[in-house]
Structure formats: structure tokens, C-alpha cells
């Protein structure tokens, strides 16, 4: 047979202190008058007990039935429920893409850069010990690397054999030519760094 919802609100006294009973499927809810709270409107409402402020916000009672939340940096809203987006003011460098944090932001860096703001150059020569072949020397550059080839070899990674007539040439290949001038290592705050 079909289930019939019992209207709990037909039975008086569920909601105290003048509260209005609202029937719900399989349940009911009390809508309390100002100054009362709780499932049955049986408790006196004290604005900051418990605190409605979230994300570490501090509650301050401003009246008999009103409160104000003082939010921690990075949060906003009447109960500090919203994390402020820090990306509109971001300073991600060298092609980094902003990722919002709590009262800060981080940068998702392209492969050649690292650090919280993508200001630290990745040393490709350390990451790829065999980047240059046939005895070529790897030279780290800001935003990339280069191979200095020994006589007789050329190409991106010194893998191309040069004819004897050109054997005096050294070829310097810049894997990624980006005109940055100096490495930057941010000291401290390593927990913010996103390495890619």
C-alpha cells in the first residue's frame, strides 16, 4: 500500500514559545520566534553561543538578537563563509598561472620555472644529466638550457655529426630562448612552493 506522511504538526506542543510547526516528509521543523532557538524552540537564542562564524571567524554580539563576525584574513561574508579570491591581484611570473589559496595564492609554473611565484629557474642540467650527448657540456640558462658541443658534433643535443670541414665549430643551442636575466631563490615559505 501507499505510505501516508504523518503530519506531526497536527499534534500541538511540538514547537514551544510560539514557534510555528512546519510539516516535512517523515519529519517536521520548528520556525522559532525571535529570541528562541533549538529543535523545539525551547532554548533562549544567544547570538554567539554557539558561534555562527566559520573559518576561524570571531563572533561579537551586537544586540539582543544580532551578531557580527570578524573574519580572519582571506575570508568574507556574514559568517566568514567565503574564501576571497586572491588571483585577480596575482603576480605569477614567467608564464605562471594563478591558483587561489587562503589569503594568498600560488602559481602553477611552466616546466622551466619553479617557486611560489615562478621566479626560480629550474636547472635542467641537474634534472637531465644526459641532456647533451657525445661529450657536450650542458649550460643552464634562465628559462631553459643549452648544449656546448665538442668538435665534430652539433645540433640541439650534440647528436649530429659535422663534416670534417666544419669540425672547428662549437654549436650552442638554446632549448628555450627567453630573455630573463637572473635566477631568484625565495628563502623560507617552502611549503608554498609548487614544483613542476
Amino acid at each position: 500500500g501507499s505510505e501516508t506522511d504523518v503530519n506531526e504538526c497536527d499534534i500541538p506542543g511540538h514547537c514551544q514559545h510560539g514557534g510555528t510547526c512546519l510539516n516535512l516528509p517523515g519529519s517536521y521543523q520548528c520556525q522559532c520566534l525571535q529570541g528562541f532557538t533549538g529543535q523545539y524552540c525551547d532554548s533562549l537564542y544567544v547570538p554567539c553561543a554557539p558561534s555562527p562564524c566559520v573559518n576561524g571567524g570571531t563572533c561579537r554580539q551586537t544586540g539582543d538578537f544580532t551578531f557580527e563576525c570578524n573574519c580572519l584574513p582571506g575570508f568574507e561574508g556574514s559568517t566568514c563563509e567565503r574564501n576571497i579570491d586572491d588571483c585577480p591581484n596575482h603576480r605569477c611570473q614567467n608564464g605562471g598561472v594563478c591558483v587561489d589559496g587562503v589569503n594568498t595564492y600560488n602559481c602553477r609554473c611552466p616546466p622551466q620555472w619553479t617557486g611560489q611565484f615562478c621566479t626560480e629557474d629550474v636547472d635542467e642540467c641537474l634534472l637531465q644529466p644526459n641532456a647533451c650527448q657525445n661529450g657536450g657540456t650542458c649550460a643552464n640558462r634562465n628559462g631553459g638550457y643549452g648544449c656546448v658541443c665538442v668538435n665534430g658534433w652539433s645540433g640541439d643535443d650534440c647528436s649530429e655529426n659535422i663534416d670534417d670541414g666544419n669540425s672547428g665549430l662549437n654549436d650552442i643551442f638554446e632549448a628555450q630562448k627567453i630573455e630573463w636575466h637572473e635566477n631568484l631563490y625565495f628563502q623560507g615559505h617552502h611549503h608554498h612552493h609548487h614544483h613542476h
Epitope: R91, Q93, G95, N103, P110, Q116, E182, Q187, G188
Partner: antibody
């Protein structure tokens, strides 16, 4: 050699308009954030506006004091940065510097500055 | 906006003196601090970036230190060409903000 050369400053009446230019050379313009910074006579430095690089879609940020009045833009084909200044006020009187944000959270190259005087 | 409190506003010193300028920020800027030197009628010149990194071509008598909200610029032995105004600037987020400046004068 990195060079930035501003032009376009001059005397203008309150409520008037002026367009500043900054011609750059010696680096790949589209790779860098570019900034406008101003300095009133005998006062400190005040950041005005910025345009991020190509990797950040050339997005723009303004200081609260010039928002809705000033417009920053760039022409990559001419390697030139612009600052269109409308509804000018006497308090906008300053030397305006164009500067390059060198990829290290600092302004590593500056132009010589161009003087903007707003007076009736 | 991040507030920058730079002190002192001026300092009188002699050639050879050690000069220290401090900059305090209203929130953590993760070492995204730069120092500039400006002489009358000239553009600012970058001295230090990343709180402690010396810009190319800047003499080693200039040094920077600090983290979090407290930063310092030190000139170890003041030279005649160092008499100028110095500014700190945070590069952590927009709007970029500068300290009020410190004028280093001859005693």
C-alpha cells in the same frame, strides 16, 4: 640593452585627457609585465596601472585612484605601452614612469619619465 | 592593500658609515620585496629584489635581508654616490605599494 622611453606628457586642464606612450627596446615586449608608476613633485612613488604578459592574457590591474579614468594598453607590433588618461584631476600632476617587471617581482628597468601637469 | 611602513624617513650620515633602513609590511609578502635608489631628477634604480638578491651591477656594499613582514636594507660603508632617497616596494600582489622613502643625507 633594455630601454624604455616615455612621451606624451604636458600641460592639460582639469577634466581633460592625455595619452602617454612608452617605446621599449632590447627585450621581447610580450614576455613581460609592464607598469606605470607616478611621482608627484617632492613625494614618493605611487603605482598606477599594470598590464600582465602574453602568458597571462595581457590582463590589466589599476590603482583605486585611477580606475575608470585611466586605461593601460600595449601594441606589441610597435613595442609600445600606452596610458590613456581621462577626466584628469589636479592631483594627477606628477612625473609618470613606465617600467618593466623583470620576472622577479621587481621593476628592473625604468624610463626617464614624462611630466604631466593638470592645472587651469 | 598592503601597507608599507619605511623608517627612518631621513638619516644623516658620513662617508664610511653603516646605514640601515627598515621596511615593515601589513601582511606577509613572502620575501617579495625590492629596494630602489633614486637621485634627484632621475628614475628609480633597482638595487635588491627577492628581499636579499643583489641586482646585476649593484655594489656589494648594498645588502638586503628579512622575511615575512620585516625587511632591512643595509649600506655597509656609505660612499659619496650613495646619498639619495631609498624606497622599498612589495611585489607580492597588486596594487604594488611603496614605502614612503628614506632620504640619506650628508652629515
Amino acid at each position: 640593452e633594455v630601454q624604455l622611453v616615455e612621451s606624451g606628457g604636458g600641460l592639460v586642464q582639469p577634466g581633460g585627457s592625455l595619452k602617454l606612450s612608452c617605446a621599449v627596446s632590447g627585450f621581447t615586449f610580450s614576455d613581460f609585465y609592464m607598469e606605470w608608476v607616478r611621482q608627484a613633485s617632492g613625494k614618493g612613488l605611487e603605482w598606477v596601472a599594470a598590464q600582465r604578459n602574453k602568458a597571462n592574457d595581457f590582463s590589466i590591474v589599476y590603482s583605486a585612484s585611477v580606475k575608470d579614468r585611466f586605461t593601460i594598453s600595449r601594441d606589441d607590433s610597435k613595442s609600445t605601452l600606452y596610458l590613456q588618461m581621462n577626466s584628469l584631476k589636479t592631483e594627477d600632476t606628477a612625473v609618470y614612469y613606465c617600467s618593466r617587471d623583470g620576472g622577479k617581482l621587481a621593476l628592473d628597468a625604468w624610463g626617464q619619465g614624462t611630466l604631466v601637469t593638470v592645472s587651469s | 592593500d598592503i601597507q608599507m611602513t619605511q623608517s627612518p624617513s631621513s638619516v644623516s650620515a658620513s662617508v664610511g658609515d653603516r646605514v640601515t633602513i627598515t621596511c615593515q609590511t601589513s601582511e606577509d609578502i613572502y620575501s617579495g620585496l625590492a629596494w630602489y635608489q633614486q637621485k634627484p631628477g632621475k628614475s628609480p634604480k633597482l638595487l635588491i629584489y627577492g628581499a636579499s638578491r643583489l641586482q646585476d651591477g649593484v655594489p656589494s656594499r648594498f645588502s638586503g635581508s628579512g622575511s615575512g613582514t620585516d625587511y632591512t636594507l643595509t649600506i655597509s660603508s656609505l660612499q659619496p654616490e650613495d646619498f639619495a632617497t631609498y624606497y622599498c616596494q612589495q611585489g607580492f600582489k597588486y596594487p604594488l605599494t611603496f614605502g614612503g622613502g628614506t632620504k640619506v643625507e650628508i652629515k
